[in-house]
């Protein structure tokens, strides 16, 4: 290009469809210059124009020769340029922000602009830069890139930005520019100019204000507070901690809190002070709701479902900021909300959901929501398998007969489609409780009935009941206890009977024991005693309870005595016993000793004894008839332990073992014995029958049985030199070598001669008796031998 000719040809495009080419005019040319621009392409095109630029349709790929001829007063000049797409710059039009708005409550800016995509021939990627500035001094706060695509039509774009500082605190400015990253264009691509700036500001009134107000944020977050003030702010505190002031426009200030701590339930105070005033806001720092823990749904009545859960980690947010819960059932689309007034019981929350007709499977989602977030738990439940029945109420007991009762109770709910397993606790006084399980068909009307058999007549029972469903989820709580006395029945057995002849042998005394309650089957009112022989039966008058003895004058013929117990319902079977004993000539008296509390008696099996054995016992020192008590044991027994509260150690008892056949008893063994042997309480009385110069003859008496207190096993006789009323040691003092002891084990021996003594010498004699229970006290005597003749 010659100097003085058009030069510096440059082309730009803003839409890829039209190139705007411009050049510099030759030096020295004035306004009146015309140009002829010729473009060498398929068809040679020339354009006449009066300005130094030309808009031409975009040229396809390749080099093009552009000739610019300038025609002016003092001649013409021509320049030739080679033009290629690569020499063209793509500079988008300056964008325009259509709208900038703000949500002050969330400190969010909303931006809206048009990409003017309709002027572009192809789809292209666009990069937008959005610049956010703050304060009158327009400090850059944020530079953001935002990607969109041109799609051949004008598209509105929206973008939002949440400010870390409340928007009320300072004016905020926004500008945008764009860069079109077209794959179809090989030239230079450049950023557009920045759009005209738009701003958002809060219109303060004359009042001082602190922002944000009542904000709820996550523990650990950063947050900025500001005070919009006409007066100078002196200090700012969060809680009791002073914070450095960040100066904004005018007297306005801000503070930035990093990693905020959890708030108390009343929130955390943020306070700004001026010379004369104090201004505050409250921040609530807490947590989003934890996933509800241990979500469990069950029903008490198949009418409503009770769902319980534990809220998990505390959110530290209360009142209107507390977690709200919604229970959604997905099959039905029904939901219920947890009311905050329903305060949690023992840390767990609960909600009731009305059951739906013909729906057994429920898919529950429990949504937890607070200002910081949400969470959920899900549970799929077949509600017929999750029945936790109410406590049975109106529990009643009615008699059916003496061994059966009818139990009725109320269990609210509609259980027509399920079966119950109910557990009945049956407790007799002073016995182990019994539990019986019964299966009952569920009903709609809540009333239940069950019969209970195999009970004892005239027995006080305590009943209670609890129920679960047959598929078992949980037992209900136990009902109240009901005490009930079953009705009377005929006594099931005759009384345990014995007989003894009176001491003069003229009367037969019949004894019987009161029937145990489980055999009496009611209150025994009286007894009938009758006496029968082959010829006749004689009945005694009715004997009222509690008399358990009757006396009949009988001869020595054999009679069968019958005793019958009667209650209000009827009479027991008779107890029969023969008046006469079956003789037994082959009897020895044996000795037996017990084991402290009782006495073990054993015998050989005797197949002849067909009804039972009777052991009777009495205190051997008592007068006839000898009867203290008796015990019946079955005929297949060969031993028994006799125990009685009346047994005392050191007391001698007689025991008699009888065998029974055909209601007649034969004495099989006669025993004397002690439950426990003790030492004798007295010493034997002894006398000196004869003395000589070298011997003494001693004689003693038996100790009475009551004072013996055991079986006598022998005597201990001590003797040694000694005088009455002297300081010489007594015979039984230990350490004396001259004392002699004789152990007399022949208990029939009643005399003892002591020989080889010295004449005219005083001897101290001591006598003691002993049993297996110990040695008794001593009896002593002083004797002087005669002089040697």
């Amino acid at each position: 290009q010659k100097k003085g000719a058009p030069h510096d040809l440059k082309c730009v495009t803003n839409n890829l469809q039209v190139w705007d080419c411009y050049w510099k005019a030759p030096s020295g040319t004035g306004r009146g210059t015309d140009y002829e621009v010729c473009i060498e392409n398929r068809s040679h095109s020339c354009y006449q124009l009066e300005k130094t630029n030309i808009k031409i349709p975009a040229l396809s790929h390749g080099d093009y020769e552009i000739t610019i001829n300038s025609l002016h007063d003092f001649g013409s000049s021509t320049s030739k340029f080679t033009l290629n797409e690569q020499n063209v710059s793509l500079i988008p039009d300056t964008p325009e922000i259509l709208n900038l708005s703000a949500d002050f409550s969330t400190s969010t800016l909303y931006l809206k602009w048009n990409d003017r995509g309709s002027v572009f021939p192809h789809h292209s990627n666009v990069i937008w830069e959005i610049k956010i500035l703050r304060k009158e001094s327009m400090e850059l706060v944020k530079l953001v890139t935002h990607n969109t695509t041109l799609n051949g039509k004008d598209t509105l774009h929206h973008w939002s930005w949440a400010s870390d500082m409340p928007l009320e605190c300072a004016i905020h400015f926004v500008e945008i520019r764009c860069y079109i990253d077209s794959l179809h264009f090989s030239g230079r691509k450049e950023w557009s100019d920045w759009s005209p700036v738009k701003n958002i500001s809060w219109m303060p009134d004359s009042q001082t204000k602190v922002f944000p107000q009542d904000k709820v944020i996550l523990v650990g977050s950063d947050i900025t507070f500001c005070c919009i003030s006409q007066e100078k702010v002196l200090s700012a505190l969060i809680g009791h901690t002073n914070c450095p002031l960040i100066h904004l426009d005018g007297e306005n200030v801000a503070i930035k809190i990093h990693n905020i701590s959890v708030s108390a339930s009343s929130g955390t105070n943020v306070v700004f002070t001026t010379e004369d005033n104090i201004f505050g806001t409250v921040i609530f720092a807490g947590y989003p709701p934890d996933t509800p823990q241990q979500l469990n749904c069950e029903t008490h009545d198949l009418k409503e479902i009770l769902c319980r859960w534990n809220p998990g980690r505390a959110t530290a947010l209360v009142g209107p900021r507390a977690t709200s819960y919604t229970l959604l059932e997905s099959f039905s689309g029904k939901y219920v909300r947890f009311k905050r007034a329903e305060a949690p019981t023992n840390g767990s929350y609960q909600l009731f959901f009305q059951m739906l007709p013909n729906q057994e499977i429920y898919n529950f989602t429990l949504n937890a929501h607070n200002p910081l977030g949400r969470s959920e738990s899900t549970i799929l439940v077949n509600i017929t398998e999750k029945v936790y029945p109410h406590t049975p109420t109106s529990f009643k007991v009615k008699d059916i007969n003496s061994t059966a009762v009818k139990l009725s109770w109320h269990l609210p709910g509609n259980f027509a489609k399920i079966n119950f397993l109910c557990q009945i606790e049956i407790k007799k006084s002073n016995t182990v409780q019994e539990q019986r399980n019964v299966t009952i068909k569920g009903v709609e009307n809540s009333s239940y009935l069950v019969a209970l058999d195999k009970l004892n007549p005239y027995t006080v029972y305590t009943f209670r009941i609890r129920c679960s469903t047959e598929t078992f989820w949980k037992w209900s709580k136990w009902s109240n206890k009901k005490q009930h006395l079953t009705t009377e029945a005929i006594p099931s057995k005759g009384p345990d009977t014995w007989r003894e002849w009176s001491s003069d042998g003229k009367n037969l005394i019949i004894y019987w024991k009161p029937l145990p309650i489980n055999e009496a089957n009611g209150k025994i009112l009286s007894y009938n005693v009758s006496c029968s022989s082959d010829e006749e039966t004689q009945s005694l008058s009715e004997i009222p309870d509690p008399q358990h003895k009757a006396e009949i004058q009988l001869d020595k013929n054999d009679y069968i005595i019958s005793v019958v117990a009667k209650n209000s319902v009827g009479s027991s079977p008779p107890s029969k016993i023969a008046s006469m004993e079956i003789p037994n000539d082959d009897l020895k008296i044996e000795q037996v000793v017990g084991m402290g509390k009782g006495i073990l008696l054993t015998w050989h099996y005797d197949p002849n004894m067909t009804c039972d054995y009777v052991i009777k016992w009495c205190n051997s020192s008592r007068s006839e008839p000898c009867l203290m008590d008796w015990r019946k044991v079955p005929s297949n027994s060969t031993e028994t332990v006799i125990e009685s509260d009346q047994f005392r150690p050191g007391v001698r008892y007689n025991f008699f073992l009888y065998g029974c056949r055909n209601q007649g008893y034969q004495l099989l063994r006669s025993m004397i014995g002690y439950i426990e042997e003790l030492a004798p309480t007295v010493a034997p009385n002894f006398t000196v029958e004869d003395t000589s110069a070298d011997s003494i003859l001693v004689k003693w008496e038996d100790i009475p049985v009551e004072e013996l207190r055991g079986f006598l096993r022998g005597y201990l006789f001590y003797f040694g030199k000694g005088e009455r009323d002297t300081s010489k040691m007594r015979v039984l003092e230990s350490g004396r070598s001259d004392i002699k002891v004789k152990n007399i084990t022949d208990i029939s021996q009643k005399t003892l001669r002591i020989a080889d003594l010295q004449g005219k010498t005083s001897y101290h004699l001591v006598l003691r008796a002993y049993t297996d229970g110990g040695v008794g006290p001593e009896k002593s005597m002083y004797v002087v031998t005669k002089e040697n003749s």
Epitope: D205, Q207, T208, K209, V210, Q213, D214, L237, H240, S266, G267, N269, V271, T273, D276, N277, I278, F279, G280, T281, V282, G319, P320
Partner: antibody, heavy 122, light 108 residues
Framework: QVQLVESGGGVVQPGRSLRLSCAAS????????MDWVRQAPGKGLEWVAV????????FYADSVRGRFTISRDNSQNTLYLQMNSLRAEDTAVYYC???????????????WGQGTLVTVSS | EIVLTQSPGTLSLSPGGRATLSCRAS???????LAWYQQKPGQAPRLLIY???SRATGIPDRFSGSGSGTDFTLTISRLEPEDFAVYYC?????????FGPGIKVDIK
């Protein structure tokens, strides 16, 4: 139990001074902000002044600023209100009141004394 | 300063009735800083509600508070004979702390 007992009220001429005291007991006085609130005869409540728990800051109603001074002696568990340049419109029952929250700065008033009457009259 | 207005000035109701008392602020008040007090003749005020909705210790649950921004309400669900008194609202979020003029609840 918390007790606040005001004293020092009485009849005073306009332009003169008066000092009210409030004896506190039953709580940790040094941990609570304290306020004075007044009530003119037959009228509503008017907040007068507040002092922080540690005495570091004091704030006043516009109507008394520059004339009244609130102070406290934490060792004596006592709150004071020094009233200078009294005016007829200062005639009221003056209540001292404790702020609800332990150690907090902006608090509702949960315990009040029975009040002491100040009459400003010539 | 923040001006609080209360309405109605007087509320005449029967025991067992429901009382709804209104408090309006001249500018937005943080709900955390709004309280209600009850005052009976010859007695000091008594704190009922703080933080707009939290009941003070020992206050029966027939008293409840609600509201935010500039409009707040105190509700007494079933008036008992001892509830007839004057009720004041107070903002304590920015000084000067201000009270409303009070609402007198008297027996109809």
């Amino acid at each position: 139990q918390v007790q606040l007992v005001e004293s020092g009220g009485g009849v005073v001429q306009p332009g003169r001074s008066l000092r009210l005291s409030c004896a506190a007991s039953g709580f940790t006085f040094s941990s609570y902000g304290m306020d004075w609130v007044r009530q003119a005869p037959g009228k509503g409540l008017e907040w007068v002044a507040v002092i922080w728990y540690d005495g570091s800051n004091k704030f006043y109603a516009d109507s008394v600023r520059g004339r009244f001074t609130i102070s406290r002696d934490n060792s004596q568990n006592t709150l004071y209100l020094q009233m200078n340049s009294l005016r007829a419109e200062d005639t009221a029952v003056y209540y001292c009141a404790r702020e609800l929250w332990f150690g907090e700065l902006l608090s509702p008033l949960d315990f009040w004394g029975q009040g002491t009457l100040v009459t400003v009259s010539s | 300063e923040i001006v609080l207005t209360q309405s109605p000035g007087t509320l005449s109701l029967s025991p067992g009735g429901r009382a709804t008392l209104s408090c309006r602020a001249s500018q937005s008040v943080s709900s955390s800083y709004l309280a209600w007090y009850q005052q009976k003749p010859g007695q000091a005020p008594r704190l009922l509600i703080y933080g707009a909705s939290s009941r003070a210790t020992g206050i029966p649950d027939r008293f409840s508070g609600s509201g935010s921004g500039t409009d707040f309400t105190l509700t007494i669900s079933r008036l008992e004979p001892e509830d007839f008194a004057v009720y004041y609202c107070q903002q304590y979020g920015s000084s000067p702390f201000t009270f409303g003029p009070g609402i007198k609840v008297d027996i109809k």
